[in-house]
């Protein structure tokens, strides 16, 4: 696939326009229920979440329901159907399994209470793709400088298990970040399409943290970071074969 996608605001066959879903968390200024996030980990399923602060307050709105439309008839009528699964994605959520998910049509969703709409959003699945974290991070030593002060390492990882990389259904790009353990700011490397990357000029006497996250190429947003990989580089004196190093 090519092209870049961000956020949808309309359903193509609907004569109305709606505010778009922001894949990130939204601030909820009013106490009415609001959509907070919709996410697809692998372009085959997705879930949407909402706030429900009002039910903990004084105002009684009645049960919150999610309705969606994914295909309109030629008369432009909206066929709203209720959430197929309120359970699988946790509290205040709706989960759409693969039978309810296609990247080839626009979706609109709305929250209702007592028959009234309290929030309404539209998007396409590709815009809400946020992959699961990369897994199985490991590292190997590449080189140590002649001075014994710096070393280069190769970091490797695997794509998330649910990302169909082999058939090209998902093309992921990865961002690696690293820092010394006692630092607060992460150093960011340029995005890459491979599942390994060299990291150069690390200080031998320091311990480093490395993490990786991924996004679908040309669309969607970065997913969560992997678990942190800790890299401890041995002192020069621990190396026995000096001719291996430059």
């Amino acid at each position: 696939f090519s092209g870049s996608e961000a956020t949808a605001a309309i359903l193509s066959r609907a004569p109305w326009s709606l505010q778009s879903v922001n894949p990130g968390l939204k601030t909820n200024s009013s106490k009415e229920p609001k959509f907070t996030k919709c996410r697809s980990p692998e372009r085959e399923t997705f879930s949407c979440h909402w706030t429900d602060e009002v039910h903990h307050g004084t105002k009684n709105l009645g049960p919150i329901q999610l309705f969606y439309t994914r295909r309109n008839t030629q008369e432009w009528t909206q066929e709203w159907k209720e959430c197929p699964d309120y359970v699988s994605a946790g509290e205040n959520s709706c989960y759409f399994n693969s039978s309810f998910t296609s990247i080839w049509i626009p979706y609109c969703i709305k929250l209702t209470s007592n028959g009234g709409t309290v929030d309404e959003k539209c998007f396409s699945v590709d815009e809400i793709v946020q992959p699961d974290p990369p897994i199985a991070l490991n590292w190997t030593l590449l080189n140590v400088s002649l001075t014994g002060i710096h070393a280069d390492i190769q970091v490797r990882w695997e794509a998330p298990r649910n990302a169909d990389i082999q058939k090209g259904w998902m093309v992921l790009e990865y961002e690696l970040q690293y820092k010394e353990v006692n630092e607060t700011k992460w150093k960011m490397m340029d995005p890459i399409l491979t599942t390994s990357v060299p990291v150069y000029s690390l200080k031998v006497d320091k311990e480093y943290e490395v993490r990786v996250r991924s996004k679908q190429r040309n669309s969607g947003n970065y997913g969560e970071f992997s678990e942190v990989l800790y890299v401890t580089l041995p002192q020069m004196s621990q190396f026995t074969c000096e001719e291996d190093f430059y």
Partner: antibody
Framework: EVQLVESGGGLVKPGGSLRLSCAAS????????MDWVRQAPGKGLEWVAE??????????YYAESVKGRFTISRDDSKNTLYLQMNSLKTEDTAVYYC??????WGQGTLVTVSS | EIVLTQSPGTLSLSPGERATLSCTAT???????LDWYQQKPGQAPRLLIY???NLASGIPDRFSGSGSGTDFTLTISRLEPEDFAVYYC?????????FGGGTKVEIK
């Protein structure tokens, strides 16, 4: 009433280029997801490309058979969809249909690639 | 990609008869994302049925669709003269959108 009118087809030599246009009316074009679908003479239908609305950042998708050679684009101010076809091959010979998310179709324009 | 195979290739029937057209997918397709089109000679395809069983605008109720998983069916209960045409199934579920090869319904 939705109307889609294609133009720009014709005879072109292999390796040549052609630009198809589709004039749209009867719906809010700027909000629409638009596709090109083609049909080789006496054959079935083949999806070619899709372009989404401005709200979707005009995201584009292509069939593997045309990726890197064809470019779908749109001009919302003119209610017009385009298909720029480069490096044409004989197997690209077909009637090209402009469609509104494959629900409404134009009458098509014939592209013949032959030496 | 998901390949759709339509059978039979040609169906020879008389007006008033029942027509049953089959569409088989190489992998499972959600019923929400399977459509049928009708195409007459020299004309563009026309959406007939969407989401397996829903009639598109202006389509008479002698047309009906059914199926799930990998097997889908278009049925014309009583063929009218204007129904003789080529019919295509179309999926847009997981892979790129694909069409079946078509079934020609011709007058016997």
């Amino acid at each position: 009433e939705v109307q889609l009118v294609e133009s720009g087809g014709g005879l072109v030599k292999p390796g040549g280029s052609l630009r198809l246009s589709c004039a749209a009316s009867g719906f809010t074009f700027s909000d629409a997801w638009m596709d090109w679908v083609r049909q080789a003479p006496g054959k079935g239908l083949e999806w070619v490309a899709e372009i989404r609305s401005k709200a979707n950042y005009h995201a584009t998708y292509y069939a593997e058979s045309v990726k890197g050679r064809f470019t779908i684009s749109r001009d919302d101010s003119k209610n017009t969809l385009y298909l720029q076809m480069n490096s044409l091959k004989t197997e690209d010979t077909a009637v090209y249909y402009c469609t509104l998310i494959r629900d409404y179709w134009g009458q098509g324009t014939l592209v013949t690639v032959s030496s | 990609e998901i390949v759709l195979t339509q059978s039979p290739g040609t169906l020879s029937l008389s007006p008033g008869e029942r027509a049953t057209l089959s569409c088989t997918a190489t992998s499972s397709v959600s019923s929400s994302y399977l459509d049928w089109y009708q195409q007459k000679p020299g004309q563009a395809p026309r959406l007939l049925i969407y989401s397996t069983s829903n009639l598109a605008s202006g389509i008479p109720d002698r047309f009906s669709g059914s199926g799930s998983g990998t097997d889908f069916t278009l049925t014309i209960s009583r063929l009218e003269p204007e129904d003789f045409a080529v019919y295509y199934c179309h999926q847009y579920h997981r892979s790129t959108p694909t069409f079946g090869g078509g079934t020609k319904v011709e007058i016997k």
